[in-house]
Interface confidence: medium
């Protein structure tokens, strides 16, 4: 067992670590998210720039300076390409967030046009016929009970909406989109502990050939691209989706991560490659948005001044455009997308970020230089709730995002998306299919605390993301009734 | 159709523990979601706990919390509730419902298992 004194002869402070977890039992067992890990341990060593810690055996550095992140991020981001994550390219392995950095350069390029302002804009009326059904099925609940569990209700909505922009599939029951989501859920929820035998022993999953994976979500995966691909009879469609520029793909049979094109560092694109893919929109467009905008809906439901401001809001400008809500309105819903960002700031969904040095590596503004394959992490739920950068940061207050006070503070200061090239490729998708239903919602209803909402929501220790322990309870109340 | 069927309730003991079941059968795809409920004579009925078959999410109600677990067994289709510490408070007729995704309207419901707590 390696011994825990590489941190010590390196003279970086850090937590003591236990016997077998390094400083992430409680993650290991399970009783705390890695987040809310992370973010402890930001915060046990409030005037150092990097804490050593071990994720299990292996030591790896959590950056709190923020001028550090900005160096590991954007400035020298071709030292930290690669997200570190080890385990097989079979099976789901090589998507587009595991990859490392060359696989990623060769996807990125070509993934990066499906989110231009031009193709979103041609989603939105996906996004809008979803979110008119979502707002109809909640309408029909709410006879029976005004009670919803939003988090998960809200997943049906992402569900469809991800289907539709991405895939071209209608879930035309709720019984079908159900079976979806339920096979989906899986990979989020189930506890494997693969991950933590990386980061006991890296490259270990790689050499194995293990996935993270449960099989079922890989044939889930595999059978969704079969039926595509014979319903384009395996060519692009002309509907410039997601599915199109992968069936665009195919046909080129490989993609090359320098613009050279040089074959020495060429992916080929294998059905294995596609469902990949396929794998990481549905997992990144459904329950980052669905957890997000539940987030937020407990926000408002607990402070109704600020609801009562974007219900103002809202109708304001749906009623000087006939009603409708446009992709062009939801930009222009200032407080709202104020009040989205404070919502990312206080749940900030993937966590921790993390990075591999490619190369040896000296931290700037420190005496501390870390080895090759070193994993660098970055707590943004440590950062976004640090008193130094926001003021109550307990306190849900949209107003901390205007564009004045947002100047005034260090640009890694948020990090809900990541930061620089390696970022969230679909953060506008996010926004924009999380504002158009929170539109819909407010158009119609208000949403208030209801006898079980929990007024002290812990964060779900069982999965990969943040999300909300037993989810979030809460009354949606049709405008009718209150005005 | 759902059907449900509770059993384990009974007399018990001030600070005895007991583990109440209830099986689920007929169409449980339909089912997101199984909640245990309860009712105190004159009372209104309550919702103590709640866990989800896919993801195993769970919610507890703040008057139950850290003396009620609930837990799942996929294969059986049975959901369990195990009560420690029991107080005569605890006494009343629990009911286990399914509900499906995202609502809070229990569209399936067992038939009740009495629980008395003697002091």
């Known amino acids: 067992m390696r011994t825990f004194n590489y941190w010590k002869k390196r003279n970086v402070r850090g937590p003591e670590p236990v016997v077998f977890f390094g400083n992430l039992k409680d993650s290991a067992l399970r009783k705390k998210n890695m987040g809310v890990v992370m973010e402890e341990l930001y915060n046990m060593f409030p005037e150092e720039k990097v804490i050593g810690i071990y994720r299990m055996t292996s030591p790896c550095l959590l950056v709190r300076d923020l001028d550090v992140i900005k160096h590991i991020m954007i400035k020298d981001f071709e030292v930290f390409s690669d997200r570190g994550v080890e385990f097989s390219k079979e099976g789901l392995g090589s998507n587009l967030f595991h990859a490392d950095g060359e696989t990623w350069r060769a996807l990125g390029n070509r993934f990066t046009p499906i989110f231009t302002s031009g193709k979103l804009k041609n989603m939105f009326y996906l996004m809008h016929e979803g979110a008119d059904n979502f707002i109809d099925h909640v309408s029909a609940e709410c006879e029976k009970n005004q009670e919803f569990e939003v988090h998960s209700l809200l997943q049906t909505y992402t569900m469809s909406t991800i289907a539709a922009c991405a895939f071209g599939i209608s879930y035309d029951s709720i019984g079908d989109k159900v079976k979806a989501l339920d096979i989906v859920d899986k990979i989020i929820s189930e506890p494997s502990y693969a991950i933590e035998l990386d980061m006991m022993y890296p490259g270990l999953l790689s050499k194995l050939n293990l996935s993270i994976f449960p099989t079922v979500v890989k044939n889930f995966f595999k059978s969704l691209v079969d039926n595509i691909v014979a319903q384009r009879n395996g060519k692009p469609s002309g509907r410039n989706d997601f599915m199109d520029l992968i069936l665009e793909l195919r046909q080129l049979g490989e993609v090359t991560s320098n613009k050279y094109g040089s074959s020495a560092s060429s992916l080929e694109i294998t059905d294995e490659v596609i469902c990949a893919q396929a794998f990481v929109f549905y997992i990144a467009g459904y329950e980052t948005s669905a957890t997000t905008m539940a987030y937020m809906i407990y926000q408002l439901a607990l402070n109704p001044d600020i609801q009562n401001k974007l219900i103002a809001e809202v109708d304001e400008v749906l009623k000087a455009n006939d009603g409708k809500v446009t992709y062009d309105t939801v930009k222009e819903m200032k407080y709202l997308n104020k009040a989205f960002d404070e919502t990312l700031r206080m749940y900030s969904i993937v966590e921790p970020l993390q990075r591999k040095a490619t190369r040896d590596y000296k931290i700037p503004g420190t005496d501390v230089v870390i080895e090759k394959d070193t994993i660098v992490l970055i707590s943004p739920r440590g950062i976004h709730y640090d008193p130094k950068y926001y003021d109550n940061p307990k306190q849900f207050n949209p107003d901390r995002f205007d564009a004045e006070e947002v100047g005034k503070r260090h640009p890694c200061a948020y990090l809900p998306f990541g930061l620089g090239q390696r970022n969230c490729i679909g953060m506008r998708f996010g926004r924009l299919q999380s504002l158009l239903c929170i539109t819909k919602i407010l158009s119609k209803f208000r949403i208030e605390p209801s006898k079980n909402t929990d007024r002290n929501l812990q964060v779900e220790p069982h999965r990969g993301l943040i999300g909300p322990k037993g989810g979030i309870r809460v009354n949606a109340i049709p405008r009718k009734l209150v005005s | 159709q759902v059907q449900l069927q509770e059993s384990g309730g009974g007399l018990v003991q001030a600070g005895g523990s007991l583990r109440l079941s209830c099986a689920a059968s007929?169409?449980?795809?339909?089912?997101?979601?199984m909640g245990w409920f309860r009712q105190a004579p004159g009372k209104e009925r309550e919702l103590v706990a709640d866990?989800?078959?896919?993801?195993?999410?769970?919610y507890y109600s703040d008057s139950v919390k850290g003396r009620f677990t609930i837990s799942r067994d996929n294969a059986k289709n049975t959901v369990y509730l195990e009560i420690d510490s029991l107080k005569p408070g605890d006494t009343a007729v629990y009911y286990c419902?399914?509900?499906?995704?995202?609502?809070?309207?229990?569209?399936?419901w067992g038939q009740g298992t009495q629980v008395t707590v003697s002091s």
């Open positions: 419902a399914s509900r499906a995704r995202g609502t809070v309207s229990y569209n399936y």
């Open positions: 007929g169409r449980t795809s339909r089912s997101y979601a």
């Open positions: 866990i989800a078959w896919s993801d195993g999410r769970i």
